[in-house]
Interface confidence: low
């Protein structure tokens, strides 16, 4: 008799996750000396630990600490970039500007970009067919949980002047409800952090309106600004010519705005 | 030219032992990891154990941990995999495969060996 399987929402866990998770973490301890110390196989165990046997609604901060305490890592705080619905530039620019880091750019973030997971009650299964959609289902499932920890620990990490990258081509270029607005705004140190620095990315060759303007962007400072932090805001009209001047700034193009 | 040549397959009983090699050439051995995949007869590829480049770092799926035992020899640019209480499920192509080149997803992306045949049965 093929035994009864909750059918959630969601896409189920990414197909090979468990070789993905000890691969990715190979890959980065072999090329992060700083983390050469870390025991991927553990690192794996305690993954697996948070969400395997138990509800997938019913995942919580706590399942997670364990992963947390193994993948603890210091980044430079005054260094940290945090982007919102623009993660692929996000990237290419810290790949460039290696001496900045966005959350995947650390070993728990890296371990789990672009991955689904979760497991089923009562069995030690991971479910490949199916997995909670954070509105359709339940917010308390495993992925979205594990983003909001360590998003969480991420800025509370936080120091000096904080940049956040946004994209000036959505209708709201902050989002109260993404993770940087429910969560990463709210958990900056006011007593570690003295400036969000928020860069607004332009998606039309023509924009050259100033998004910073934006009552998005107002909603933001406000919030910002009642948590006794700086707010200060840059557009990025070309990020194509903003990434070129990143990787050659010496270019006699790179002084005019960007 | 990369090379990966795995040897040592066979037909063994249940609960028997086989230890499998693999010669690798063509690329600075030590410098990467290495892993075992297997294809059991119309399945896919299963990842089973890798090692780290230095060889400190051993990892096991959970269907063969505390009965395999993967180790490497860079100094004869070797890898191993040492095969205890072999059960019938274990009955598969083993091929040895390079970290070289990974995207970070997976094992067996880069370079494979043309694989060896382990057999268990009574």
């Known amino acids: 008799v093929p035994r009864w399987r909750q059918q959630w929402s969601g896409p189920g866990t990414t197909k090979r996750f468990p070789e993905t998770v000890l691969a990715r973490c190979v890959k980065y301890t072999e090329i992060h000396p700083e983390m050469r110390h870390v025991d991927c196989q553990s690192v794996w165990d305690a993954f697996k630990g948070a969400f395997i046997s138990k509800h997938p609604c019913n995942i919580t901060e706590e399942d997670y600490q364990p992963l947390m305490k193994l993948g603890t890592q210091t980044v430079p705080c005054n260094k940290i970039l945090l982007w919102s619905r623009i993660k692929d530039l996000a990237h290419q620019f810290t790949q460039v500007q290696r001496d900045m880091f966005t959350l995947e750019d650390t070993l728990l973030g890296y371990l789990a970009d672009d991955l689904t997971w979760c497991g089923e009650f009562n069995t030690s299964k991971i479910n490949y067919q199916s997995c909670p959609d954070w509105r359709k289902d339940c917010s308390n499932n495993p992925v979205s949980v594990f983003w909001k920890t360590v998003s969480r620990r991420f800025a509370e990490a936080a120091c000096d002047v904080v940049h956040v990258m946004l994209n000036g081509s959505r209708s709201k270029i902050f989002d109260k409800n993404s993770t940087f607005g429910s969560v990463e705004v709210h958990n900056l140190q006011p007593e570690k952090v003295q400036t969000l620095e928020a860069w607004v990315i332009h998606g039309g060759r023509e924009d050259s309106r100033d998004l910073c303007q934006d009552p998005t962007i107002k909603e933001l400072e406000s919030i910002i600004s009642k948590r006794n932090i700086q707010f200060s805001c840059k557009n990025i009209y070309r990020p194509d010519k903003f990434l070129q001047c990143v990787k050659n700034p010496e270019d006699s193009s790179c002084t005019s705005e960007i | 030219e990369v090379q990966l040549l795995e040897s040592g397959g066979g037909l063994v009983q249940p609960g028997g032992s086989l230890r499998l090699s693999c010669a690798a050439s063509?690329?600075?051995?030590?410098?990467?990891?290495m892993s075992w995949v297997r294809q059991a007869p119309g399945e896919g590829l299963e990842w089973v154990s890798a090692i780290s480049g230095s060889g400190v770092n051993t990892y096991y799926a959970d269907s063969v941990k505390g009965r395999f035992t993967i180790s490497r020899d860079n100094s004869k640019n070797t890898l191993y995999l040492q095969m205890n209480s072999l059960r019938a499920e274990d009955t598969a192509v083993y091929y040895c495969?390079?970290?070289?080149?990974?995207?970070?997803?997976?094992?067996?992306?880069?370079?494979r060996g043309q694989g060896t045949l382990v057999t268990v049965s009574s």
């Open positions: 063509g690329f600075t051995f030590s410098s990467y990891a």
């Open positions: 495969a390079s970290g070289k080149g990974w995207d970070g997803n997976t094992w067996y992306e880069d370079y």
